[in-house]
Interface confidence: low
Amino acid sequence: FSGDGRAVWSKNPNFTPVNESQLFLYDTFPKNFFWGVGTGALQVEGSWKKDGKGPSIWDHFVHTHLKNVSSTNGSSDSYIFLEKDLSALDFIGVSFYQFSISWPRLFPDGIVTVANAKGLQYYNTLLDSLVLRNIEPIVTLYHWDLPLALQEKYGGWKNDTIIDIFNDYATYCFQTFGDRVKYWITIHNPYLVAWHGYGTGMHAPGEKGNLAAVYTVGHNLIKAHSKVWHNYNTHFRPHQKGWLSITLGSHWIEPNRSENTMDILKCQQSMVSVLGWFASPIHGDGDYPEGMKKKLLSILPLFSEAEKNEVRGTADFFAFSFGPNNFKPLNTMAKMGQNVSLNLREALNWIKLEYNNPQILIAENGWFTDSHVKTEDTTAIYMMKNFLSQVLQAIRLDEIRVFGYTAWSLLDGFEWQDAYTIRRGLFYVDFNSKQKERKPKSSAHYYKQIIRENGFSLKEATPDVQGQFPCDFSWGVTESVLKPESVASSPQFSDPYLYVWNATGNRLLHRVEGVRLKTRPAQCTDFVNIKKQLEMLARMKVTHYRFALDWASVLPTGNLSAVNRQALRYYRCVVSEGLKLGISAMVTLYYPTHAHLGLPEPLLHAGGWLNPSTVEAFQAYAGLCFQELGDLVKLWITINEPNRLSDIYNRSGNDTYGAAHNLLVAHALAWRLYDRQFRPSQRGAVSLSLHADWAEPANPYADSHWRAAERFLQFEIAWFAEPLFKTGDYPAAMREYIASKHRRGLSSSALPRLTEAERRLLKGTVDFCALNHFTTRFVMHEQLAGSRYDSDRDIQFLQDITRLSSPTRLAVIPWGVRKLLRWVRRNYGDMDIYITASGIDDQALEDDRLRKYYLEKYLQEVLKAYLIDKVRIKGYYAFKLAEEKSKPRFGFFTSDFKAKSSIQFYNKMISSSGFPSENSSSRCSQTQKNTECTVCLFLVQKKPL
C-alpha cells in the first residue's frame, strides 16, 4: 500500500531557476476546481453558553489555562451574525464553505438524545442558505471542541468509550444534514488533538508529559474515524452519495544536506511521525509506520489484523491541512535536526509518492498576521500567492490530483493557544465592536480575483514585439572604476644605450660607449591591463564602453597642485585604444563604490560631500578631465548614482540632504564649465546617472501602497531629476512630505532651501537622461519615526518569493524598465535617454542563463518603449564587463577574465539591433555598427609589450 516519499528530497537539490516559468506558473487551475474557504466552530461562533449550548473542553481550557483571555465569547459571533458570513462568502465567490459543527451546541453533554433546538436551527439555516447560493457545504464533525462532560466523565479521547459516542453523534449529523452535505470530514487534524492536547498541554484539555496517553488518544481518534467511515459507507452513502475523509495536518521539512542519506532519512522520519502516524493506517496499509513501531515499542498501541482491515482505506480522498498550527511552536516539532519549510508543493509530492497518488483536497491552507494588522494584510497576499502557485505547479507539472483548495480562514477569530494575538481571516473583524462587521482584507480581494480567473493570468506584459533599435543606438557595457596602472608594465624600449653581450667571455652585458639610440616613445600597450580590457571589449562587440576614472588616483591631494599625469595617460590610452576598435567611451568622473567614497583622502578628511569645498574641488577635477580627455570622449557622466551615495551620509536626514545638495551643485558646476569652456570645441554631452529602479505597490489593493510607490520614485529619482531636468528645485511632493512629518514631530529633517541663483544654476544642466536600472522594488507604506532619509520616506520593501530573482535577491521584472521610461518621459518631457547600467548577478561561471534571460526580456521591454511608447532611447549599457572576486557575479567575464556564454547572446542582440522579424535584413550599414574583425582581435591579443 504505502510507497516511499523519500524520493522527494532526491530531486535536483541545486536547481536554480533561470526563467520565470521555472519558478512561477502563469496558468489556470483545472476546469471544475473546487475553491473554498473554511472556519472552525469554536473559533468563530462565539455564544459559548447561549441558547442551551454546553461547554466544550476549549471553553474550560480558556478559563483555566490561557492568560488574558476570558472566553471565546467575543470572537466573530458567527452564531449571531450568520447573514454577515453569507455576505462574505458571496463577496469572494467560493464554490464551497467548510465549517465545523459544534458538538456541544447540538448535544450539550455529548450524548445523543434530543438535539438542542436552537443549535439545530442554526446549522439548518446555514446549510439551507448555502444550498440556496449554490455553495457546497463541507462539514467537519469534530474540530477540537469536545463536550466538556465527556472529558470529565470518561477522560475524553483517552477512553475508547468515546468512539461509539462519536459514532452516534456522526449518525445523527448524517441523518439530519446528509441530504444537503456531500462532503464530510470526521476529525480536523488529529495529530494536534493528540500531540498538543495530551503531550505539550498547549491545547485543551491541557494534559502534558504522558507519551502513552498521546498515542492512546491518536489510536482512539483513528478508530473513531474508521468506525464513522464504515457507518457512512454502509448506511448513508448508497442514498446520499457523498464522500467522507479525515483532515490530516503536517509541516514540511528539508534536509540540512540534500545529498546526505542520513539527513533525508531524518526528514522521512519527521514526516512519518506526524503525517504518517495517521495517514499510514488510513491511507496506507492499515497499520502504523514501521519506524514508529520500532521507536515507540510498547508506547504505541497495536492494531489487530482485524482492526488493520477495518482502518485501511477509510478515506474517500486525502484531506490535507498545511498551516501555522503544524509549525508551532518550533521547539515541539519533530524536526530531527533538519530544516522546516513552507514548501507545500513538495509536501503534496510526498503524499503522492507515499500514498499512491490519491485525490487531494487541501482542507486548510494559509498563514497568519499579527493582531494589529487590519485590512491591509499585504504579507498574507504573498503567502497565499506562494502557496497557490505551489499547488498549481503540483497539479500542472507534477500531475498531483488536487481537486480543491480551502483558504483559511473566512474570518478573524479565536486562534487556539494564540487566542486573539494573531489573525487568519480573509475578513477583518473588530472583536470589541458590537456589530462585528466583516471587512474584506486585501487577501479577500486577492482570493476573489484568483477564483474569478481560476488561477494566474499573465496580464502584466504586452506581448513581445519584433523590431529593431535605431542604427545609431549605443550598445554598451559598463565597468566601474578602472584603477590606473601606476607604472607602465613594459619599459624595455626606454633605455637609449647599446649593449654587447659576452664580449670578454664573462657572459655579461657591456655598454658600448659613445653610442645612443633613439628610444621608442611610451606606448599605450605598455599597460598590461589595457590589453586585457581591449580583449574583453573586442569580444563584446559593443559600440560603447562606459568606465569610471578614479578621482583619488588622478588628484591624490584633491587639488590641481599634484596631477598624476601617468594616471591621465593611462585613461587616455583606454579611450584611444578603444576608438581603434570602433568603441567609443562614456566616461564617468566620479563613481563611488566603497564606504571610503572614492574621494581623495584630504577631501574625505575635510568632511567629504558635507563640505562645500569638495564641490569646488570636483569642478576643478572635472575641468582637468575635460581638458585632457575631452577631444576623445563625447559622452560624460559627472557622478554615478548620487542618489545612492547620499545614503552613506545617513547620520541624519539633514546630512543626507546636505550631501545630496552639494552633489547636485558639483554636477551643475561641472556641466556649466563644460558648456562654457569645452562644448564649443569638443561637442560632447554631459549628464549624471541616477539609480532608477522602478517601484510597484506591494499591495495593489491598498491606496497607501500606490502612494508609497510614487513617493519612492519621488525620493529616489525626482529628488535629483526635478532640480536638474525641470524646475531647479526639489520635488514639491518630497518637500511637502518631509515638511508634513516635521510638523507632526515625526522627523526633524528638512530639505535645503534653494536660492534663486542656485535654482538657475541647477536647472537644465543635463544633455541627456542617464538611468541605472536593475530591478523593480515592491514597496509598502509604513510610518517610520526618526530623522533619517530612510525613515523620512515611510517606505518598507517586500520581497516577493514567487518572483524570479538573483542570488542577491534582485527580482527579474522586465516590464518595470518600460514603466520607468514612460514615467520619466511623462514627468520630464521628451529627452534622449540612456540606460547606463542594467544587469543581474548570476552564479554561473560559464553558462549564465539567468543573465541571458534578463538581457533578452529587459531589452524586449526597452524596445517596446522605443517602438510603442516612442521614448527616445539612445543606448543600453549592460552591467558589467568583468566581475570582481568575492562580489556578486554581475560580469560578462569572470574575475580571472574567462568569458561567459551571455557574451555571444549579447553579441547576437547587437548584430541584429534587437529583435528583427525572420525576413528582415539588417538595416544598418557596417560603418554605423561596430563589428568584430578576427584579425583585429588577433592583433589586440598579440600586440607586443
Partner: antibody, heavy 124, light 109 residues
Framework: QVTLKESGPVLVKPTETLTLTCTVS??????????VSWIRQPPGKALEWLAH???????SYSTSLKSRLTISKDTSKSQVVLIMTNMDPVDTATYYC????????????????WGQGTTVTVSS | SYVLTQPPSVSVAPGQTARITCGGN??????VHWYQQKPGQAPVLVVY???DRPSGIPERFSGSNSGNTATLTISRVEAGDEADYYC???????????FGGGTKLTVLG
C-alpha cells in the same frame, strides 16, 4: 558618529538563556548598506563569529551554534538582539557586536565599527 | 566550512617590516579583511577588500591576496603596532563569516 554598545547580564547560570542587546547610533538598521554581526572571544582565545543580520532581515548563523542562536532587530529602537539558549561555562567570553558595511547594497566589506564588548561569565 | 590558517606569532624589530599571512583554499578568489586587536580593546578594521585601508589607518598597513595566501604587511613597525591580528572572509557558499585563529605580533626591544 557611528557607535555600537552591547548590553546584557554579566553573570549567567548554566542552562539559562542569554539575551544580549546591541544599541546602535549614527546609522540606520534599515540602511541597505548596513548589517550587524555578533562575535565572541573567550578569554585568551580567538574571535568567533556567531550570527549576522542583514538590512532586509535575512539572518545567518554559525553552523556549530545555529540551534542555540536567534538574532533579530528592532529598527525603531535601533537595536539588534542576540538570544543564546542553554548556556554553558565554555560560553564564558566577551561578546561584541559590529557593523558590517556592504557596498552597492550587496557586497560585504568587513566590520568597520565594533562595540566595546560585554563580558559574560557562565557559572553556577 | 571554510578554514583560515594564521601563524600563532610573528616577531619583528622596530622600523622593520612585518608580514602576517592568512592561508585558505584559493583565498585569492575571496575578499580578505584584517583586524587589529590590542589587549583589553575591541578589534579595529585595518584593511578591507584585500588591500583597501579605512580612513584613519596609517599607510604603513597594506594588504595583498592571491593564490592560497593573503598577507597583511606592516612597514616601519612601531611599538604601538604590537597586537593580535585577525584575518576574515565572508564565505559566500554558506553565508558565514570566518575568522582566522589570530597572530600575535611582538615588537622586539
Amino acid at each position: 558618529q557611528v557607535t555600537l554598545k552591547e548590553s546584557g547580564p554579566v553573570l549567567v547560570k548554566p542552562t539559562e538563556t542569554l539575551t544580549l542587546t546591541c544599541t546602535v547610533s549614527g546609522f540606520s538598521l534599515n540602511n541597505a548598506r548596513m548589517g550587524v554581526s555578533w562575535i565572541r572571544q573567550p578569554p585568551g582565545k580567538a574571535l568567533e563569529w556567531l550570527a549576522h543580520i542583514f538590512s532586509n532581515d535575512e539572518k545567518s548563523y554559525s553552523t556549530s551554534l545555529k540551534s542555540r542562536l536567534t538574532i533579530s532587530k528592532d529598527t525603531s529602537k535601533s537595536q539588534v538582539v542576540l538570544i543564546m539558549t542553554n548556556m554553558d561555562p565554555v560560553d564564558t567570553a566577551t561578546y561584541y557586536c559590529a557593523r558590517s558595511v556592504v557596498t552597492g547594497g550587496y557586497y560585504y566589506d568587513g566590520m568597520d565599527v565594533w562595540g566595546q564588548g560585554t563580558t559574560v561569565t557562565v557559572s553556577s | 566550512s571554510y578554514v583560515l590558517t594564521q601563524p600563532p606569532s610573528v616577531s619583528v624589530a622596530p622600523g622593520q617590516t612585518a608580514r602576517i599571512t592568512c592561508g585558505g583554499n584559493n583565498i585569492g578568489s575571496e575578499s580578505v579583511h584584517w583586524y587589529q586587536q590590542k589587549p583589553g580593546q575591541a578589534p579595529v578594521l585595518v584593511v578591507y577588500d584585500d588591500s583597501d585601508r579605512p580612513s584613519g589607518i596609517p599607510e604603513r598597513f597594506s594588504g595583498s591576496n592571491s593564490g592560497n595566501t593573503a598577507t597583511l604587511t606592516i612597514s616601519r613597525v612601531e611599538a604601538g603596532d604590537e597586537a593580535d591580528y585577525y584575518c576574515q572572509v565572508w564565505d559566500g557558499n554558506s553565508d558565514h563569516v570566518v575568522f582566522g585563529g589570530g597572530t600575535k605580533l611582538t615588537v622586539l626591544g
